[in-house]
Interface confidence: medium
């Protein structure tokens, strides 16, 4: 199958908001944990027929491996469950979500695994180079979104310790050949390119050699241009609030957008006793919008001071870019101060939003 179909790769971890579209998620689990991967469709609707794949092979459901169209669970995980997982559309093999899973013997800090493949004393007197971790070199085709970091690895050994060099499309590859340069980590047998761009596409070959021989491995890199999308608003924000009369309230709205977003805070109002106009559009008043001196960070917070009963109602965070609009709403309930004091006597605390 062609890995060229791997565009708009999205990672989602179960129970937590996933990263922005375009990211491959790196997940670390402890041995014995349950690995849970979730791949919800964009927009929340049903997804087309999917298959879950690990290191290029379709996963077969079992008592330990629970497979659903939008969710994968691997119970009692072990080191062998580490690898590259993807959720793919069945017919086209298009990758919808992609995860890199590492299962460690102990709970991990999530540090990078550099250093694992340093040259080691193999006990061999003399010998030609050989791959020490061939299972880590299976993924010969790599499709990543632009702006991601790519690392190619060719962990090897031999005696004397071999040298490693890199070619791009069959020619010597050096840092000056790309904007942003490259990182050659000889002790980790790796080539690292940060913030990849479409011109980084090509075939990358590691050449490992000593006086007894030479081995090489070629990887193909495809850099996928980001699909534009309307702003993404963090789930659960803004949150409903309950406040005491006269207190201060803050609503928060977290906006993710490739294109420059325009953020507005709206309050829903009634006109002649109606909340919506003849066309079904809600009546709103703009409370906060971008001005000459406002930053995006400032716009992500709506502050209400000394709230009155008139401030109660529905508030909406509206974010738009050149692609479209997204909005999330929340309600503010304003309670009279004396009711709050009664609650305080009964519950032993005052909840003021």
């Amino acid at each position: 199958e062609s890995l060229g179909t791997e565009q708009r790769v999205v990672g989602r971890a179960a129970e937590v908001p996933g990263p922005e579209p375009g990211q491959q998620e790196q997940l670390v689990f402890g041995s014995g944990d349950a690995v849970e991967l979730s791949c919800p469709p964009p927009g929340g609707g049903p997804m087309g027929p999917t298959v879950w794949v690990k290191d290029g092979t379709g996963l077969v459901p079992s008592e330990r491996v629970l497979v659903g169209p939008q969710r994968l669970q691997v119970l009692n995980a072990s080191h062998e469950d580490s690898g590259a997982y993807s959720c793919r559309q069945r017919l086209t093999q298009r990758v919808l979500c992609h995860f890199s899973v590492r299962v460690t013997d102990a709970p991990s800090s999530g540090d990078d695994e550099d250093g694992e493949d340093e040259a080691e004393d193999t006990g061999v007197d003399t010998g030609a180079p050989y791959w020490t971790r061939p299972e880590r070199m299976d993924k010969k085709l790599l499709a990543v979104p632009a702006a991601n970091t790519v690392r190619f690895r060719c962990p090897a050994a031999g005696n004397p310790t071999p040298s490693i060099s890199w070619l791009k499309n069959g020619r010597e590859f050096r840092g000056e050949h790309r904007i942003g340069g490259i990182k050659l980590r000889h002790q980790q047998w790796s080539l690292v390119m940060e913030s990849v761009v479409p011109s980084d596409r090509g075939n990358y070959t590691c050449v490992v050699e000593n006086k007894f021989g030479s081995i090489r491995q070629t990887y193909t890199l495809d850099v996928l241009e980001r699909s534009p999308h309307r702003p993404i608003l963090q789930a659960g924000l803004p949150a409903n609030q309950t406040a005491v009369l006269g207190s201060d309230v803050e609503f928060h709205c977290k906006v993710y957008s490739d294109a420059q977003p325009h953020i507005q805070w709206l309050k829903h109002v009634e006109v002649n006793g109606s909340k919506v106009g003849p066309d079904g559009t809600p009546y709103v008043t703009v409370l906060k919008t971008a001005g000459a001196n406002t930053t995006d960070k400032e716009l992500e917070v709506l502050s209400l001071h000394n709230v009155t009963f008139e401030d109660a109602g529905e508030y909406t965070c509206l974010a738009g870019n050149s692609i479209g609009f997204s909005h999330h709403s929340a309600w503010l309930v304003v309670l009279p101060a004396e009711e709050e004091l009664v609650e305080a006597d009964e519950a032993g605390s005052v909840y003021a939003g």
């Epitope: 062609s2 179909t5 469709p41 049903p46 087309g48 027929p49 298009r94 534009p228």
Partner: antibody, heavy 119, light 108 residues
Amino acid sequence: EVQLVQSGAEVKKPGESLKISCKGSGYSFTSYWIAWVRQMPGKGLEWMGIIYPGDSDTRYSPSFQGQVTMSADKSIRIAYLQWSSLKASDTAMYYCARLDYSGSWFDYWGQGTLVTVSS
Amino acid sequence: EIVLTQSPGTLSLSPGERATLSCRASQSVSSSYLAWYQQKPGQAPRLLIYGASSRATGIPDRFSGSGSGTDFTLTISRLEPEDFAVYYCQQYGSSPWTFGQGTKVEIK
């Protein structure tokens, strides 16, 4: 606004070759599959195959494998459907359609290209 | 391949009436991977429903889809003049993707 605009109607003789086109705009053309669907006169819809303009990966319906060729030029945002030797039975309306994000249903359609093959 | 059979072939109704269109699959359509399209004379099809019951963007709520397995239904609660057209179901759960032969909804 997502739009798929197809080339104009064609009248051909049996044995002739033909290439019709579908130009996408208003979205990331290289990031969505394009399908081709045939509708013979007075009949229903038949799925022919799909192409991913990002790398020209193609998948054909078994009924159309070897009968037509799908291609794409991402630099000009156009997908193509071509025949090397037309038959009278190829007379039909041909639609291109964009597949949704998950590559399943057809969310936007072109206006169709009528191909008439007659001696 | 999965064969989709739509019934009735033609449905004659008046504006304001309720239309119920059926789509039956020759074998189970996994996870309700079924879509409905509307096609008017001289026009391209238009997506109405996907995932058996999810309305596509901009589709009025008088259109609803239901069903699972082998039996699926498209319901138009109150027919408007612009709803008279041909309706096709399509499954995308198994390759090759297939369409039903269509149901024509005509004015009585």
